[in-house]
């Protein structure tokens, strides 16, 4: 349906508070270098041209379309050439090419100071101050530092920010309160982030018909009592509203996710029997609700996929004449009998069994030739099965840090050319799976892991492709998304890597180690683990653990030490020399 | 040496009919998909439709109802018969074989040396 | 309704130039399903390459595809004189009845 003005029916559907921060986020998003004070200038900018646009539709500009209005916004940005450089060539561009360009200049790794958490009294003293003002700030310094993350939900996060600071700033002991809610908020944050990451690198890498796929699978999963008609229905919903969102259209997407969720909420019974207390929530609370509804039950007595997708004389018809839906019903089918598979093992499944038909059809005996499709699933299906275990009993005997430790060396020797930083923070990523998925019954670990893992080996992929160094990681990347994790598993030491000129700078660790939180001081360790496998990429895992107790010991010692910089300064050197020594 | 050789073509009046063949030889036929693709005179190529091994067929839409491909393997042979011909069917006809390991795929790595029809009164 | 776009539709060209041509498909092709083709006047078409970048045996490798989704490039690193002829594309799609062939681009000498 058409409107005269879109920049009016978006702040008419949203309301104001949405507009403006759906507007912030936006500009953020784009704009991820510019001062707070300069975005609230734009937003109220917008704001107030957009309330003119509400009064009259047909006054001068309010035909525009959104792209043309923000982009012309940004494009008054007087620093833009000299803070961003070529993204100002962007506004040389006429749109829809305008709007390509900002999005191709968004930096998923900017070069920004890490967030550092005030005083309990002092954030409380600025919330009472001005809860506007702090509660923007939230938003642009989350939308600056995440520019894919899912605008709707940043939204939802911010009320809970909100909340917590209203709830907390009144209590008695305010740190107590405040610091655990702003910690789960935090790492909630930054797992949505990734998450969403995933599913703009799905559309915008691979196109719509990866990101559908892989809706219909886990659709299917959650709502396995819905029919195919209706998981369609909802893909095609949520598609249209990712689309909108990993595309910068940041109002139509929070537009379209609300009219999502009230579909939802009015076709409960045709969905699934869980919605039912996420319907009774407010709006940004019942969306995201609903995104993250549990599995439902799976219906009772589901007959065998056999009779359908081997035995049926139709199976190659049916291929042949309508691919998407055929393969589309097979992976609804396969996806909701299969709560305990991965989304992207039912993917791979769903591939295995196109391959087969695709190779079969055309045959003398197609029957003959695809009769045992079923059975190549199976190596298929162990293979994440036995993954999920030798990682979760890896991850049981070493704990936490020295799980991380050993996926450190594993990838390191993988792909010794990606830089230590990225390594660092992959790595430690990797090895949260551990906490995260390994408690889980078993019916639950391998979903929990592998999309876990997809998630984490995508923001390898976003930062490798903005400094590419490694052609073993380009092509895991880009040849096929569902194989990306059985792609990286499958990388062994890298042969052909020269390795790294020992350089005791790199080695050298001063009294500021001491005064680090525990987290600091594993990051700083793994840094130097790291380096020391892209020295000794073929060091063994006795060496390399010998080498981290003495770094550990060497701190330890020098941290109680009376003079701790002396320490450092003497023992420096003893330790890379006997870890030189340890490596020869 | 596989070969595919058409044969069948010439001149027919606006709403006549023709059958044309495709004699396959080097390789057992009944292994194999088989596609008729036409190309008018300085035109784009135009896929017709195909035969799999088992005998199912699949057309275009637009050739759908008049173009019928049949198979008969104990001749290595494939036939395209056509109906209701129009001046707008004039073209060169060609057999084509789909790459092995395909079925829907656009990958015809065979070819004969192509028919002309041409429909004019 | 589907459609395939080859550009330019035609291109004059010395011996060992480059040549890049491509080709829109609306909507995207079924799983990189898609192949092009060399024909030379008077000759049957060639098939060249397949799933958008795998090379047929004995195609010298100076030609390579590329692409994904709906936009597709045929290049011609260098080109020889036995290169001269038409180029096309060939798309399938969801349905196999949908398979479609682009128009053609005629590479012809400078």
């Known amino acids: 349906d058409t409107h005269k003005s879109e920049v009016a029916h978006r702040f008419k559907d949203l309301g104001e508070e949405h507009f403006k921060g759906l507007v912030l986020v936006a500009f953020s998003q784009y704009l991820q270098q510019c001062p707070f004070e300069e975005h609230v200038k734009l937003v109220n900018e917008v704001t107030e041209f957009a309330k003119t646009c509400v009064a009259d539709e047909s006054a001068e500009n309010c035909d525009k379309s959104l792209h043309t209005l923000f982009g012309d916004k940004l494009c008054t940005v007087a620093t833009l050439r000299e803070t961003y450089g070529e993204m100002a060539d962007c506004c040389a561009k006429q749109e829809p090419e305008r709007n390509e360009c900002f999005l191709q200049h968004k930096d998923d790794n900017p070069n920004l100071p890490p967030l550092v958490r005030p005083e309990v009294d002092v954030m409380c003293t600025a919330f009472h101050d001005n809860e506007a003002t702090f509660l923007k700030k939230y938003l642009y310094e989350v939308a600056r530092r995440h520019p894919y993350f899912y605008a709707p939900e940043l939204l939802f996060f911010a009320a809970r920010y909100k909340a917590a600071f209203a709830e907390c700033c009144q209590a008695a002991d305010k740190a107590a309160c405040l610091l655990p809610k702003l910690d789960e908020l935090r790492d909630e944050g930054k797992a949505s982030s990734a998450k969403q990451r995933l599913k703009c690198a799905s559309l915008q890498k691979f196109g719509d018909r990866a990101f559908k796929a892989w809706a219909v699978a886990r659709l299917s999963q959650k709502f396995p009592k819905a029919e195919f008609a209706e998981v369609s229905k909802l893909v095609t919903d949520l598609t249209k509203v990712h689309t909108e969102c990993c595309h910068g259209d940041l109002l139509e997407c929070a537009d379209d996710r609300a009219d999502l969720a009230k579909y939802m909420c009015e076709n409960q019974d045709s969905i699934s029997s869980k919605l039912k207390e996420c319907c009774d929530k407010p709006l940004l609370e019942k969306s995201h609700c609903l995104a993250e509804v549990e599995n439902d039950e799976m219906p009772a007595d589901l007959p065998s996929l056999a009779a359908d997708y081997v035995e049926s004389k139709d199976v190659c018809k049916n291929y042949a004449e309508a691919k998407d839906v055929f393969l589309g019903m097979f992976l609804y089918e396969y996806a909701r009998r299969h709560p305990d598979y991965s989304v992207m093992l039912l993917l791979r499944l769903a591939k295995a069994y196109e391959a087969t038909l695709e190779k079969c059809c055309a045959a003398a005996d197609p029957h003959e030739c695809y009769a045992k499709v079923f059975d190549e699933f199976q190596p298929l299906v162990e293979e994440p099965q036995n993954l999920v275990k030798q990682n979760c009993e890896l991850f049981e005997q070493l704990g936490e840090y020295k799980f991380q430790n050993a996926l450190l060396v594993r990838y390191t020797k993988k792909v010794p050319q990606v830089s230590t930083p990225t390594l660092v923070e992959v790595s430690r990523n990797l090895g949260k799976v551990g906490a995260k998925c390994c408690k889980l019954p078993e019916a639950k670990r391998m979903p929990c892991a592998e999309d876990y893992l997809s998630v984490v080996l995508n923001r390898l992929c976003v930062l490798h492709e903005k400094t590419p160094v490694s052609e073993k990681v380009t092509k895991c990347c880009t040849e096929s998304l569902v194989n990306r994790r059985p792609c990286f598993s499958a990388l062994e030491l890298d042969e052909a890597y020269v390795p790294k000129a020992f350089n005791a700078e790199t080695f050298t660790f001063h009294a500021d180690m001491c005064t680090l939180s525990e987290k600091e001081k594993q990051v700083k360790k793994q840094t130097a683990l790291v380096e020391l496998v892209k020295h000794k990429p073929k060091a063994t895992k006795e060496q390399l653990k010998g080498v981290m107790d003495n770094f550990a010991a060497f701190v330890e010692k020098c941290c109680k030490a009376d003079d701790k910089e002396a320490c450092f300064a003497e023992e420096g050197p003893k330790f890379v020399a006997a870890s030189q020594a340890a490596l020869a | 040496e596989v070969q595919l050789l058409e044969s069948g073509g010439g001149l027919v009046q606006p709403g006549g009919s023709l059958r044309l063949s495709c004699a396959v030889s080097?390789?057992?036929?009944?292994?194999?998909?088989i596609n008729w693709v036409r190309q008018a005179p300085g035109k784009c190529l135009e896929w017709i439709g195909i035969?799999?091994?088992?005998?199912?067929?699949f057309y275009a839409t637009w050739a759908k109802g008049r173009f019928t491909i049949s198979r008969d393997n104990s001749k290595n042979t494939v036939y395209l018969q056509m109906n209701s011909l129009r001046a707008e069917d004039t073209a060169v006809y060609y057999c084509?074989?789909?790459?092995?390991?395909?079925?829907?795929?656009?990958?015809?790595?065979?070819w004969g040396q192509g028919t002309l029809v041409t429909v004019s009164s | 309704d589907i459609q395939m776009t080859q550009s330019p539709s035609s291109v004059s060209a010395s011996v060992g130039d480059r040549v890049t041509i491509t080709c829109q498909s609306s909507?995207?092709?079924?799983?990189?399903?898609l192949s092009w083709y060399q024909q030379k006047p008077g000759k049957a078409p060639k098939l060249l390459i397949y799933?958008?970048?795998k090379l047929t045996s004995g195609v010298p490798s100076r030609f390579s595809g590329s692409g994904s989704g709906t936009d597709f490039t045929l290049t011609i690193s260098s080109l020889q004189p036995e290169d001269f002829a038409t180029y096309y594309c060939?798309?399938?799609?969801?349905?196999?009845?949908?398979?479609?062939f682009g128009c053609g681009t005629k590479v012809e000498i400078k």
């Open positions: 035969i799999w091994a088992s005998g199912t067929t």
């Open positions: 060939g798309g399938g799609y969801s349905s196999i009845s949908d398979t479609t």
């Open positions: 080097g390789i057992d036929l009944s292994n194999y998909a």
């Open positions: 799933e958008a970048s």
């Open positions: 909507p995207s092709v079924w799983s990189n399903f």
């Open positions: 084509a074989r789909t790459v092995p390991g395909y079925s829907t795929a656009p990958y015809f790595d065979l």
